[in-house]
Amino acid sequence: KFSKQSWGLENEALIVRCPRQGKPSYTVDWYYSQTNKSIPTQERNRVFASGQLLKFLPAAVADSGIYTCIVRSPTFNRTGYANVTIYKKQSDCNVPDYLMYSTVSGSEKNSKIYCPTIDLYNWTAPLEWFKNCQALQGSRYRAHKSFLVIDNVMTEDAGDYTCKFIHNENGANYSVTATRSFTVKDEQGFSLFPVIGAPAQNEIKEVEIGKNANLTCSACFGKGTQFLAAVLWQLNGTKITDFGEPRIQQEEGQNQSFSNGLACLDMVLRIADVKEEDLLLQYDCLALNLHGLRRHTVRLSRKNPIDHHS
């Protein structure tokens, strides 16, 4: 609970926000969890705390670990954990999966690619953008504020896009890069009333208390680019984001095109540390597009331990 994963590359700047945010102006203390050693606030240090932010200027592989932040108040201290991993720079062009931010998809009508985490940094335009390690050149590519716009998107524009910018701290400059995949929706095709492939209607999913569980909502909507298509999970009729249980999060999967050419979407619901109260909730997989909405309901049941007979 109140934990967040952050990652970066050695010799680049990395700034991490306390996952347990108070309002601005509250005192935030940072500690290195393994040693309980306080992180200094003096900016002359390579790693220092600045309110809700923890700054690695620049980061080193040895900085990897769990950092504790405590938002201080005389009556209500609030603790969060930042799980930081710093990786060595790759010599080749490949960006490994563990360095990738969430995938975004675009179409001819909408082709914005936002630069991940950039809002945490003190940067000035323009951003530099690369696709599969090649600098983007040509009038089709426009770096605008914190995102890239691609004109007349084509299938070939799919790939891994890296934004590069400079973070400035007291006159010193530090490089930052962040990479995410971009997928292109085909504009040709047709749409159907959503068909949910998983889960089955009124499915009972067996889970173990204390373990993690994943539920996948998978639906197909037609062929080619879908103007409006979404899959999402609801808990007791409430959106996951509104339900406010950090243990239960939904994570968008890859857009899928099966061999029959259907456009399908996945949404994985991840339940960390399953609790008894989770068994009382109703889990709804919703698939919707312009034709309408289809809902499949799942309930959780406790997995009985297997009896071992000699």
Epitope: K23, T27, V71, S73, P74, T75, T238, G244, E277
Partner: antibody, heavy 117, light 111 residues
Framework: QVQLQESGPGLVKPSQTLSLTCTVS?????????WDWIRQPPGKGLEWIGY???????YYNPSLKSRVTISRDTSKNQFSLKLSSVTAADTAVYYC??????????WGQGTLVTVSS | DIVLTQSPASLAVSPGQRATITCRAS??????????MHWYQQKPGQPPKLLIY???NLESGVPARFSGSGSGTDFTLTINPVEANDTANYYC?????????FGQGTKLEIK
């Protein structure tokens, strides 16, 4: 957006127990924050009764502690107030609210409870 | 308990003028560089609404006409310029220790 709604009897007899429930939508009460009860006698100022944190820990105003119980029902996303041995001085608008840090950031509309025989 | 005393009990101000409300604590509510004093506005028939936290920080969505200042035991809420819809009761609240307490309130009327 956190939304809170108080419910319970509007009239309680002296010496009986006042019971109110606050139903929370848009956020799980076990996720974070503290969940408060505050009251305001007609035409008067505000008095903090106490709160229950996301962890289940409770904190009460010492002036009411002997008579107050704040509890929660996590399956319904509700928290409740019980105030025993009420007198006319307990007549007030009772509010539930959310303390995110030190301040009450979201409030219910309030419910008037009158103590009278 | 920390007792908060607001003054004046009521005041009337013309639109465009400045309104100043003070709150005095029976002991210091400041520690570790922060002052744990907050201000609320309550209009008739409505719940209170947070205006200022930690003595001087404007809550998100609150107009910049509202400002707070002070430290230790003496705090001020200033509304400048006052508008017609600022008619309300204003309360200070501390969170330096338990129990959390409120001031008795100040009634602001617009002339």
């Amino acid at each position: 957006q956190v939304q809170l709604q108080e419910s319970g009897p509007g009239l309680v007899k002296p010496s009986q127990t006042l019971s109110l429930t606050c139903t929370v939508s848009g956020y799980s009460i076990t996720s974070d924050y503290a969940w408060d009860w505050i009251r305001q006698p007609p035409g008067k100022g505000l008095e903090w009764i106490g709160y229950i944190r996301y962890s289940g820990d409770t904190y009460y105003n010492p002036s009411l502690k002997s008579r107050v119980t704040i509890s929660r029902d996590t399956s319904k996303n509700q928290f409740s107030l019980k105030l025993s041995s009420v007198t006319a001085a307990d007549t007030a608008v009772y509010y539930c609210a959310t303390t995110m840090m030190d301040t009450m950031d979201y409030w219910g509309q309030g419910t008037l409870v009158t103590v009278s025989s | 308990d920390i007792v908060l005393t607001q003054s004046p009990a009521s005041l009337a101000v013309s639109p465009g003028q400045r309104a100043t409300i003070t709150c005095r604590a029976s002991k210091s509510v400041s520690t570790s560089g922060n002052s744990y004093m907050h201000w609320y506005q309550q209009k008739p028939g409505q719940p209170p609404k947070l205006l200022i936290y930690l003595a001087s920080n404007l809550e998100s969505g609150v107009p910049a006409r509202f400002s707070g200042s002070g430290s230790g035991t003496d705090f001020t809420l200033t509304i400048n310029p006052v508008e017609a819809n600022d008619t309300a009761n204003y309360y200070c609240q501390h969170s330096r220790e338990f129990p959390l307490t409120f001031g008795q309130g100040t009634k602001l009327e617009i002339k």
